[in-house]
Interface confidence: low
């Protein structure tokens, strides 16, 4: 009944509307019913429109061209024409009331069967069952298996392959060992396994910056380093970098009334220049303060060198030498003046004497027939030298002297003019101010070195060259270098040092062969107001610690091969640096940093003088020590 | 990626003052584990380090000793720069300049600018 | 100053050969301090290996360095037309960081 209906609305559409043109109500009277008809008209329209221009575009947007109007009408009613379902995914098509119906093969779904359904999805069969990978295709899906696995027979589970047992050589000389899918070939720690030669090769940890500053690779490790000289130490970790801090602070209050007479290694520390009336004789009043046992204080002269006077100190008692046209004259006199408390001298030249006073008694008095320096037109010229000589002066001295001389002068006034601006010179100057308070001993302030070119071969002894030392210390900071001998090749053949602790507010001592630590003195209070005393012995055979300490060693076997390589050291050249190391590099030593705090050395049986060093950093101070910083009660 | 530009005037005259400045991205000039140098190449001398700024904590500067007395190299952390000055120029001091990166403490320079040239002339 | 000399001046090889340049220093510059840098005309250095033996990131393996002390090597394992440039090596062992004078590659 259905179809007869069909072919009767197709003979009605036929007649109403092709073999004559129908209009919206025609149309709906062929249909009987509004929804077919609001679809059919719009379209007939279409088709009409192309037919007539003579330009037919597809009526129903299809790939097929109609070839005729009857066709392109006929074709409207039609919902299934042309195909609106996915050709990959319907089973059939319904055509219904200006609707259609789409029924889906298996794996597809939607309105037009236009999705496929994504099994691996499907929370009913979690991964489609799959063990491992489930790939879902078009209207189906499959399972595979990762990379080192095969698919057993069930088509969805998943075996592991022995890639160890299958090919033997995977590995080439390193280990190879099966894992899940996969295998491994395994290198011992810090080396790395390389695909192309199948082999195990250094890993240069270095490059992967596994240090916070500096860095040394070998065979299977690598080491870290820090700058010393910067202040920095190796940290726990062994990897970065921390500050090496303040164990002990020290008092380093300075006044600018007080001038420091060592700024200079070598050299003046002060210079002045008198123009005064010829009637005007020399004379100079201060208060001075040393340890020192030897040095310049003062030097006067004329314009033209022709006469001078020194007033110096040699062996801690006052020196004055003086040569002019009339004579030449040296005096040394008077009680020991260094003691380090401040001492008032004066140095006064009269009509037929000069005058010596200290703490304004007479210690000496010299004659001279005439007056020190002569006047010219009328003016009395002199200069003033502080701490030094102006030039090389010593072949015109009566007695040869070490000029330099760690001490202090306060108080002064010179040619009678008081202090005539020579302290606004000093205020602006730090480095030319004096410690309030110091002790006795040599202070390194951690950021230089001094060095002595010492022989430490002895002819008469069948072991050749020895080294005895003795080391009196106080340190300010917990690690740095006291002692090293450096060798022309820039290695270090041996070196003490100090180094923090693990164990909280100690110090070790260390004691070194270029990088290898041969002795390590355990967990000691070092920084402390009392001194530390260590002394010991080295020479080709062994090293001997006089000192009863709580030693760590390396191997007797392992100390030969050391101390052989000290032995070839020292019998080149070697340098005596006290207080750090020169330029070496980072990795040459375990401790690089510079030392800061008090020291005394003694090598072989001779107190070494900083005086006497080849060079010194300006800021080692040698023969003064800042006093321990004391808690008040406002601090 | 670290990347390194340069400015600064391709021409001084003899005793002026030479400046250049490197523009840092992709690192900090106050990264704890770098130095920030520069380095000049001229068919007389070839490649020649000048020196460098680094951060450790506080600033440091190091100098190579043929130019010590009159070479000034300075961060300018606002801007994540740092910039040469080299004074009392002369003709000797035409080159190539290049800033570059210090790798950690190591002076191996791992990153270089496009490099600067400045003639000293009259 | 530790002065760097490079050797030969100047080398003359075809693509796929092998080159083997040397840098000696006047004194030692400590186990490993030294790295080899590949410039072309017109650029920048570029670094190719620190540390004499470690090679930078990005650096293909045909490039190899060796040697410590006094005396170092760069190893090119089969020659590329890109390879044909100058190259410097560089000690940062001690201040001033110095370089050598450059060996030039060229084809033959």
């Known amino acids: 009944a259905n179809s007869m209906l069909e072919e009767t609305k197709q003979g009605n559409l036929e007649r109403e509307c092709i073999e004559e043109l129908c209009n919206k109500e025609e149309a709906r009277e062929v249909f009987e019913n509004d929804p077919e008809t609001d679809y059919f008209y719009p379209k007939y329209l279409v088709c009409l429109r192309s037919f007539q221009s003579g330009l037919f575009t597809a009526a129903r947007q299809s790939t097929d061209a109609y070839p005729d109007l009857r066709s392109c009408v006929n074709a409207i009613p039609d919902q299934c024409s042309p195909l609106p379902c996915n050709e990959d995914g319907y089973m059939s098509c319904k055509d219904g009331k200006a609707s259609f119906t789409c029924t889906c093969k298996p794996g597809w779904q939607g309105e037009k069967c236009e999705f496929d359904i994504n099994e691996c999805k499907d929370p009913s069969n979690i991964n489609g069952g799959c063990s491992q990978i489930c790939d879902n295709t078009p209207g189906s899906y499959h399972c595979s298996c990762k990379s080192g696995f095969v698919m057993l027979s069930n088509k969805k589970d998943c075996k592991d392959v022995d890639e160890c047992s299958l090919k033997p050589n995977m590995c080439g000389t390193a280990v190879c060992k099966n894992i899940p899918g996969d295998f491994e070939c395994e290198c011992p720690e810090g080396y790395r396994y390389n695909l192309k030669s199948k082999s195990c090769e250094d890993v240069d940890e270095c490059s992967e910056n596994m240090c916070a500053q500096l860095c040394v690779n070998y065979p299977g490790g690598y080491t870290c380093y820090c700058d010393g000289k910067k202040g920095f130490k190796l940290a726990q970790d062994q990897k970065s970098c921390e500050a090496v801090s303040v164990c002990l602070p020290l008092n380093l209050d300075t006044k600018y009334e007080l001038l420091y007479l060592a700024e200079q290694f070598a050299g003046v520390v002060l210079y002045l220049k008198f123009r005064l009336p010829e009637i005007s004789r020399f004379s100079a009043e201060f208060d001075f303060r040393t340890y020192d046992s030897q040095g310049v204080i003062l030097y006067a002269e004329s314009i033209d060198h022709s006469a001078w006077l020194l007033i110096a100190l040699r062996g801690g008692k006052i020196e004055v030498q003086l040569k002019n046209e009339h004579t030449s004259k040296i005096t040394t006199g008077g009680d020991i003046i260094n003691n380090g408390l401040w001492n008032m001298v004066s140095v006064e030249e009269l009509e037929h004497s000069i005058s010596i006073k200290i703490a304004k008694e007479a210690v000496m008095d010299i004659n001279k027939p005439g007056p020190l320096f002569k006047p010219e037109n009328g003016l009395l010229e002199t200069k003033v030298y502080f701490a030094g000589f102006p030039r090389k002066v010593e072949s015109e001295l009566i007695k040869p002297i070490n000029p330099r001389l760690d001490g202090c002068i306060r108080s002064w006034n010179l040619m009678k003019q008081g202090a005539s601006g020579i302290k606004e010179i000093i205020q602006e100057k730090q480095n030319k101010h004096c410690l309030v308070t110091v002790e006795k001993g040599s202070y390194y302030p951690g950021s230089g070195i001094a060095e002595f070119h010492i022989d430490y071969n002895n002819g008469s002894n069948a072991e050749g060259w020895h080294i005895n030392v003795t080391l009196n210390i106080r340190p300010s900071m917990g690690t740095g270098v006291m002692l090293a001998l450096v060798s022309s090749n820039n290695t270090v053949p041996f070196a003490v040092s100090l180094v923090d602790s693990t164990s909280e507010k100690s110090q070790d001592i260390v004691i070194s062969v270029e990088n290898t630590v041969i002795y390590r003195i355990q967990a000691l209070s070092l920084c402390s107001n009392q001194r530390s005393h260590l002394e010991f012995r080295v020479n080709r055979n062994n090293l001997e610690l006089l000192t009863p300490l709580k030693i760590e060693t390396i191997s007797q076997e392992e100390l030969q091969t050391q101390l052989a390589i000290l032995d070839k050291a020292m019998k080149g050249k070697v340098a005596t640096y006290l207080g750090g190391l020169p330029d070496v590099p980072f990795s040459a030593t375990p401790v690089n940093a510079f030392y800061n705090g008090c020291m005394e050395v003694n090598i072989n049986g001779v107190e070494l003088d900083l005086d006497e060093a080849i060079s010194k950093h300006n800021d080692i101070r040698a023969h003064s020590c800042p006093s321990v910083w004391k808690k008040t009660k406002n601090s | 990626q670290v990347q390194l530009q340069q400015s600064g005037p391709g021409l001084v005259k003899p005793s002026q003052t030479l400046s250049l400045t490197c523009a840092i991205s992709g690192d900090s000039v106050s990264n704890n584990n770098a130095a920030w140098n520069w380095i000049r190449q001229s068919p007389s001398r070839g490649l020649e380090w000048l020196g460098g700024?680094?951060?450790?904590?506080?600033?440091?500067?190091d100098y190579a000793v043929s130019v010590k007395s009159r070479i000034i190299i300075n961060p300018v952390t606002s801007k994540n720069q740092f910039s040469l000055q080299l004074n009392s120029v002369t003709p000797e001091d035409t080159a190539v300049y290049y800033c570059?990166?210090?790798?950690?403490?190591?002076?191996?320079?791992?990153?270089w600018g496009q490099g600067t040239l400045v003639t000293v002339s009259s | 100053e530790i002065v760097l000399t490079q050797s030969p001046g100047t080398l003359s090889l075809s693509p796929g050969e092998r080159a083997t340049l040397s840098c000696r220093a006047s004194?030692?510059?400590?186990?490993?301090?030294l790295a080899w840098y590949q410039q072309k005309p017109g650029q920048a250095p570029r670094l190719l290996i620190s540390g004499a033996s470690g090679r930078a990131t990005g650096i293909p393996d045909r490039f190899s360095g060796s040697g410590s002390g006094t005396d170092f090597t760069l190893t090119i394992s089969r020659l590329e037309p890109e390879d044909f440039t100058v190259y410097y090596c560089?000690?940062?062992?001690?201040?001033?960081?110095?370089f050598g004078q450059g060996t030039k590659l060229e084809i033959k």
């Open positions: 570059a990166r210090g790798s950690s403490w190591y002076r191996f320079f791992d990153y």
């Open positions: 560089q000690q940062y062992g001690s201040s001033p960081y110095t």
């Open positions: 004194q030692s510059v400590g186990s490993s301090y």
């Open positions: 700024t680094y951060y450790r904590s506080k600033w440091y500067n």
